[in-house]
């Protein structure tokens, strides 16, 4: 029987404080350059080693990025959510989407800490 | 395993063309900003052109006017096309990829990218 592949999602609000050479990391996504299907959202596509973002260590490649100082990233350019982070000033707030990776025994299969619902 | 192999250098006469090329592999380039750099003897490596993720370009100003890029995603190949060649163009010309759009800087800053290419020489004289 094949295993079942799920993710867990979880939020989490970020503070960085910009470094000598910024907040260091690369996105992707954004209306004009969907890099989810059906989802033009904003994702971290690179952490840049030594960076403000490395060295807090909670942001993820992969983490899709919901908000700036509280200003949501829906429905942006991918140039217009660039340049909102390079204005976002000293100190930055960001909501995060963390998706992790749940392997799941067998289909059919209920583990015993599983709800029976 | 991500590759850049540029080509296409040579010797150039003054006020000559060339097109020079780089050719990825182990990624695709859609998601990727490409840039174009220089190193002559005896300087550091500096920024001439970028192409962004979303094929946004971007040039220095002592080769704006001058200088081309594009960028072939189904070739996975980006292309330098230079003209009006002058002698201080001459250098090894490198080609870098990064994956996605800093935050930080334009495509330009050399310390964003991640993986380059062995480069090719470009001698104009």
């Known amino acids: 029987m094949n295993g079942r592949v799920d993710y867990l999602v979880t939020e989490e609000e970020i503070n960085l404080t910009r470094g000598p050479s910024g907040l260091g990391f690369n996105i992707v996504g954004g209306t004009d350059q969907q890099y989810v299907s059906n989802d033009s959202g904003i994702y971290v596509s690179r952490i840049k080693e030594n960076g403000a973002a490395a060295l807090d260590g909670r942001l993820q490649e992969g983490d899709k990025i919901l908000s700036v100082n509280g200003q949501d990233l829906k429905n942006l350019l991918h140039q217009d959510a660039v340049d909102l982070f390079r204005n976002a000033g000293y100190a930055v707030s960001l909501r995060v989407q963390h998706r992790l990776q749940v392997q799941n025994g067998p289909i059919g299969h209920r583990g015993e800490g599983d709800p029976s619902g | 395993h991500v590759q850049l192999v540029e080509s296409g250098g040579g010797l150039v006469q003054p006020g000559g063309s060339v097109r020079v090329s780089c050719v990825s592999s182990g990624f695709i380039l859609d998601y990727y900003a490409i840039g174009w750099f220089r190193q002559a003897p005896g300087k550091e490596r500096e920024g001439v052109s970028c192409i962004d993720s979303v094929g946004r370009a971007y040039y220095v100003d002592s080769v704006k006017g001058r200088f081309t890029i594009s960028r072939d995603n189904a070739k996975n190949t980006v292309y330098l096309q230079m003209n009006s060649l002058k002698p201080e163009d001459t250098a090894v010309y490198y080609c870098?990829?990064?994956?996605?759009?800093?935050?930080?800087?334009?495509?330009?800053?050399?310390?964003?990218?991640?993986?380059w290419g062995q480069g090719t020489q470009v001698t104009v004289s």
């Open positions: 870098a990829a990064d994956f996605g759009s800093s935050v930080d800087s334009t495509c330009l800053n050399k310390q964003q990218y991640d993986y």
